[in-house]
């Protein structure tokens, strides 16, 4: 049985200051190390305890990093992406895509499958509309009594 996972996808600019032990996270992905099927993007695989990213608190394991200091991370070899981070300087600006899972299904590990899903608003808008129609109908019914 195939499950379905829906995601709320948001983007955020995260500015980190390199700490004594660096930025404090690990990455997976790249054209030679696809982490998500049909996606050679760069993903955060581990946030290190007490590192700069952990202390900042915004970067999360599973986030996709779109750019570093304005430089796009598309179509990079894994090691080239690593080197880009290592040479990014003291102040590092990350453009990050967060994926908030809003519904669980019987699927495999997130990141090792298909990340596609439907945005939450596509679920919430029809539900909200139905609720409003039902409320309106109920009020009309009460007025007729």
């Amino acid at each position: 049985m195939n499950g379905r996972v829906d995601y709320l996808v948001t983007e955020e600019e995260i500015n980190l200051t390199r700490g004594p032990s660096g930025l404090g996270f690990n990455i997976v992905g790249g054209t030679d190390q696809q982490y998500v099927s049909n996606d050679s993007g760069i993903y955060v695989s581990r946030i290190k305890e007490n590192g700069a990213a952990a202390l900042d608190g915004r970067l999360q394991e599973g986030d996709k990093i779109l750019s570093v200091n304005g430089q796009d991370l598309k179509n990079l070899l894994h090691q080239d992406a690593v080197d880009l981070f290592r040479n990014a300087g003291y102040a590092v600006s990350l453009r990050v895509q967060h994926r908030l899972q809003v519904q669980n299904g019987p699927i495999g590990h997130r990141g090792e499958g298909d990340p596609s899903g439907i945005p939450i608003f596509m679920v919430l808008v029809p539900v909200f509309a139905l609720t409003m129609v039902a409320a309106w109908a109920f009020m009309r019914y009460r007025q007729q009594l």
């Epitope: 690990n26 690593v82 290592r86 590990h109 090792e112």
Partner: nanobody, 127 residues
Amino acid sequence: EVQLVESGGGLVQAGDSLRLSCVASGRTFSYYGMGWFRQAPGKERDFVAAISWSGGSTYYEDSVKGRFTISRDNAKNTVYLQMNSLKPEDTAVYYCAGAFGSTVDNYDHSDPREYDSWGQGTQVTVS
């Protein structure tokens, strides 16, 4: 995280060889940088060798260079440590360790804190 199980330890004579294996399960092995550490009784856990996710880079502790070889087979989810010309001072519990992904910081492969998954260890005794 990945689960790691070591095997291949045992009791050997000085000058003999052993090959340790570490089998991984639970997550895609090829995303992991792998390392071997050892701990002698009453001592700290020390770095022995490490290998990058692709196998393209290897690192060794000075005292084992030329005697030990780390390798991996991503198709078999296994990392190996070939130990030749064993010495009594190689006696220890040998641990396999995995680091999920590549650090974006300067990589210190000898730092146990770089690794997030550990095996239970296998005893190597050289008499």
